[in-house]
């Protein structure tokens, strides 16, 4: 089902004695209580894995954590989508699967996490120090990314938490704008409620419905989502970019994704009924890029089968424009 | 409203080679990836392959390889399918079909394009 | 390759009456099957994706349902307009392929 952070519709107290003044100094402080408590940052996690059975076969796992509808996750290696990068599979929860050599086999494993078997021999397969990275596109929150890979001391059959290097683009400039935005916000709440327990209370006229209190959202935000922002550094190694890649067929995924079935409010059927998956160690790294949906409300100029925005499929190798995927 | 507009009939001689195209307006051309599918008369469909508008990008059908050859014109929006070393066997109607991410939906489709090959 | 069959290959109806169609996937492909419309001397539409998700505008007489290799396609009180062959096709990976279609036909 489809969650969003709503603002909740308040109902103050009828002014009394401090009129319209009154009535804003007590609206405003449950607004900001309501931005302050749902600010969490979603997080994506990514699994590097190395078959214990064929050296050269890789699962990559990942997942979001966050409040969010998915609606498109793109998963890459040789760096971020859009940097370099080059599409392994893209998986949209109702539109379907597509996938590229040498990924394999790629599927939902529940509502918000993904996993990816890559095999191949020679030039097309992956080894050891391979970055890979997933990308999640999600109604609020946006899209983000992530990127893991195995140490090259790995033992096969075990799983690596990927390195945590967060990926930032220019679209860091929006989230650092809004962090502000909520920071002044909740400095200025805690303001407001300190000069009100300075003052005497107003006597307000007895309402026939109580004051309703900010619901905050279903899933509390992690300590690492609301620690501070890392300097940003991505661990992008391409000594190990498949060698058939001029002449390999896959389509690169969109450099940026807002796709959302507008008809749409149920997720697929998937494998194993979305049955939960254990999320790995903190390692796994978590992203600070977030792509706003500037248009998420927008209809497109056409009717499309349940389509109201589609990004620009940047291919694997087309680099055009900064967020072109190579 | 979104338009994919095909070229009109052909007939070809077996061994000929035939160019068709698929024009696409009222969309991003490059949103969408262009799907090629072949209708035998009376017949099914099967899907011969997909081109990336973006990098030229392409996938092919098994069957298809070494027989199809898609190209893409961004500047006039345009797809094009050539069909080489022709035979009675790919005597049908041939449509353009546009699918939006991932790439595995044909979300419109053009009027179709009848081959006939025939000496 | 996932090989589609679908059943029947063709189907006498009038209009008014229910019918159903149905397509079994070589392997599980989850919930990721759509279902296609072509009337004679036209081009194919998309109906139905996902098993049941309606494309915008297809009436709610069409319903799909189905998971992993079975699936279905009901039309409910037949209308003039729903004559024509039906297709399914897998949406999960490439190459996309078909079933070999269902022709409904007023009886």
């Known amino acids: 089902m489809r969650t969003e952070a709503q603002v909740p519709a308040l109902q103050p107290p009828e002014p009394g004695l401090e009129g319209a003044m009154g009535h804003r100094t007590l609206v405003l402080p449950w607004v900001l209580l309501t931005l302050c408590v749902t600010a969490g940052t979603p997080e994506v996690w990514v699994q590097v894995r190395m078959e214990a059975t064929e050296l050269s076969s890789f699962t990559i796992r990942c997942g979001f954590l966050g409040s969010g509808s998915i609606s498109l996750v793109t998963v890459s290696w040789g760096g971020p989508n859009g940097a370099g990068g080059t599409t392994l599979a893209v998986l949209h929860p109702e539109r379907g699967i597509r996938q590229w050599a040498p990924a394999r086999q790629a599927r939902w494993e529940t509502q918000s996490s993904i996993s990816l078997i890559l095999e191949g021999s020679g030039a097309s397969s992956p080894c050891a120090n391979t970055t890979f990275c997933c990308k999640f596109a999600s109604f609020p929150e946006g899209s983000w990314e992530a990127c893991g890979s195995l140490p090259p001391s790995s033992d096969p059959g075990l799983s690596a938490p990927p390195t945590p290097a967060p990926i930032l683009r220019a679209d860091l400039a929006g989230i650092l704008g809004v962090s502000g935005v909520l920071l002044f916000g909740c400095v200025y709440l805690l303001h407001l409620l300190r000069r009100h327990k300075h003052r005497p209370a107003p006597r307000l006229q007895p309402s026939r419905t109580s004051p309703q209190a900010p619901r905050a959202r279903a899933w509390a935000p992690s300590q690492a989502s609301q620690a501070a922002l890392h300097v940003p550094y991505a661990t992008i190694n391409t000594s190990c970019r498949p060698a058939t890649l001029d002449t390999a067929h896959p389509h690169g995924g969109p450099s940026w994704w807002a796709s959302l079935p507008t008809h749409a409010a149920h997720r697929p059927q998937g494998p194993a009924a979305w049955a939960s998956t254990p999320i790995p160690a903190r390692g796994s790294f978590v992203s600070v890029e977030n792509g706003l949906y500037a248009q998420a409300g927008e209809r497109p100029p056409h009717t499309g089968p349940g389509l109201t925005l589609f990004p620009d499929p940047r291919g694997p190798r087309a680099m055009e424009g900064p967020l072109g995927v190579r | 409203e979104v338009q994919l507009q095909q070229s009109g009939p052909e007939l070809v001689k077996p061994g000929a080679s035939v160019k068709i195209s698929c024009k696409g307006s009222?969309?991003?051309?490059?949103?969408?990836?262009m799907n090629w599918v072949k209708q035998s008369h009376g017949k099914s469909l099967e899907w011969v392959g997909d081109?990336?508008?973006?990098?030229?990008?392409?996938t092919y059908s098994q069957k298809f390889m070494g027989k199809a050859t898609l190209t893409v014109d961004k500047s006039s929006s345009t797809a094009y399918m050539e069909l080489r070393s022709l035979t009675s066997e790919d005597s049908a109607v041939y449509h353009c079909?546009?699918?939006?991410?991932?790439?595995?939906?044909?979300?419109?489709w053009g009027q179709g394009t009848s081959v006939t090959v025939s000496s | 390759d996932i090989q589609m069959t679908q059943s029947p290959a063709s189907l006498s109806a009038s209009v008014g009456e229910t019918v159903t169609i149905t397509c079994r996937a070589s392997?599980?492909?989850?919930?990721?099957l759509a279902w296609y419309q072509q009337k004679q001397g036209k081009s194919p539409q998309l109906l139905v994706y996902?098993?049941?998700t309606l494309t915008e505008g297809v009436p709610t007489r069409f319903s799909g349902s189905g998971s992993g290799t079975q699936f279905s396609l009901k039309i409910d009180s037949l209308k003039p307009e729903d004559f024509g062959t039906y297709y399914c096709?897998?949406?999960?990976?490439?190459?996309?392929?078909f079933g070999a279609g269902t022709k409904l036909e007023l009886n």
């Open positions: 081109i990336n508008p973006n990098n030229g990008d392409t």
């Open positions: 392997e599980n492909i989850y919930s990721y």
């Open positions: 079909a546009a699918s939006g991410p991932p790439y595995v939906l044909l979300d419109y």
């Open positions: 009222g969309y991003t051309f490059t949103d969408y990836f």
């Open positions: 096709q897998h949406h999960y990976g490439t190459p996309l392929t």
């Open positions: 996902n098993a049941k």
